[in-house]
Amino acid sequence: SAPFSFLSNVKYNFMRIIKYEFILNDALNQSIIRANDQYLTAAALHNLDEAVKFDMGAYKSSKDDAKITVILRISKTQLYVTAQDEDQPVLLKEMPEIPKTITGSETNLLFFWETHGTKNYFTSVAHPNLFIATKQDYWVCLAGGPPSITDFQILENQA
């Protein structure tokens, strides 16, 4: 049978930026860094100043979803983390401004942010069973679980 793709008609409206300039560390104490113009990867850094700093923007769902829906932007840029398919790298998409409304295929820009203690998970809104993940010797990607690492610690500067 032909593959079936369901695109929800839920609309997500931008509310505000809720976190600025934070770092994502995975469970192996690796930080997310820029691999190139398009991809991210993870490495245990000698100097954390080399890690990517992210901003997090919150969106409100027309469905009144209880989940926190967010967009991830590299701080001081116009680059946004964008989901592809399972085991595919997340991409950095350049946009002139943060989208005020997101729906349909554009939901690949959005993630459900869940926290369990100090562990943070980012599930793709477009692919609700897949998480932002790190994988050994690979880009930051979308994955369903092990062997990829799907839990992150958010490091906010405590200066």
């Epitope: 469970a27 104490n29 850094l45 000698h46 100097n47 954390l48 100043d49 890690a51 500067n157 200066a159």
Partner: nanobody, 124 residues
Framework: EVQLLESGGGLVQPGGSLRLSCAAS????????MVWVRQAPGKGLEWVSS????????YYADSVKGRFTISRDNSKNTLYLQMNSLRAEDTAVYYC?????????????????WGQGTLVTVSS
């Protein structure tokens, strides 16, 4: 040869302050995260705080957050820990260390170099 030399420990009353220093040599100081760890009498090593190579990012254990401040002067190759509102449970030998890799040492951290430590005793 890499060397880390801590100083500034001593006896202080509860609520008091101390400033620890760590003089580093033998490596390019500003290219590395640095951390403070401590070992209380009869206990294991506890991570206290980390600072990035350029000093742009700092992070603290919950037990010291709001009371301790980590900083560094890369022109002097020196790491600092300002300790305020000291409590009896802060009594420990404090070590500065250079992590082998990574930043937050609460779960995953190994050190390639650390100092000989400086004793901080908080008691009335």
């Amino acid at each position: 040869e890499v060397q880390l030399l801590e100083s500034g420990g001593g006896l202080v009353q509860p609520g008091g302050s101390l400033r620890l220093s760590c003089a580093a040599s033998g490596f390019t100081f500003n290219e590395y995260n640095m951390v403070w760890v401590r070992q209380a009498p009869g206990k294991g090593l506890e991570w206290v705080s980390s600072i990035s190579g350029g000093g742009g990012f700092t992070y603290y254990a919950d037990s010291v957050k709001g009371r301790f401040t980590i900083s560094r002067d890369n022109s002097k190759n020196t790491l600092y820990l300002q300790m305020n509102s000291l409590r009896a449970e802060d009594t420990a030998v404090y070590y500065c260390a250079k992590p082998l890799r990574g930043f937050v040492c609460s779960q995953h951290c190994s050190f390639d170099y650390w100092g000989q430590g400086t004793l901080v005793t908080v008691s009335s």
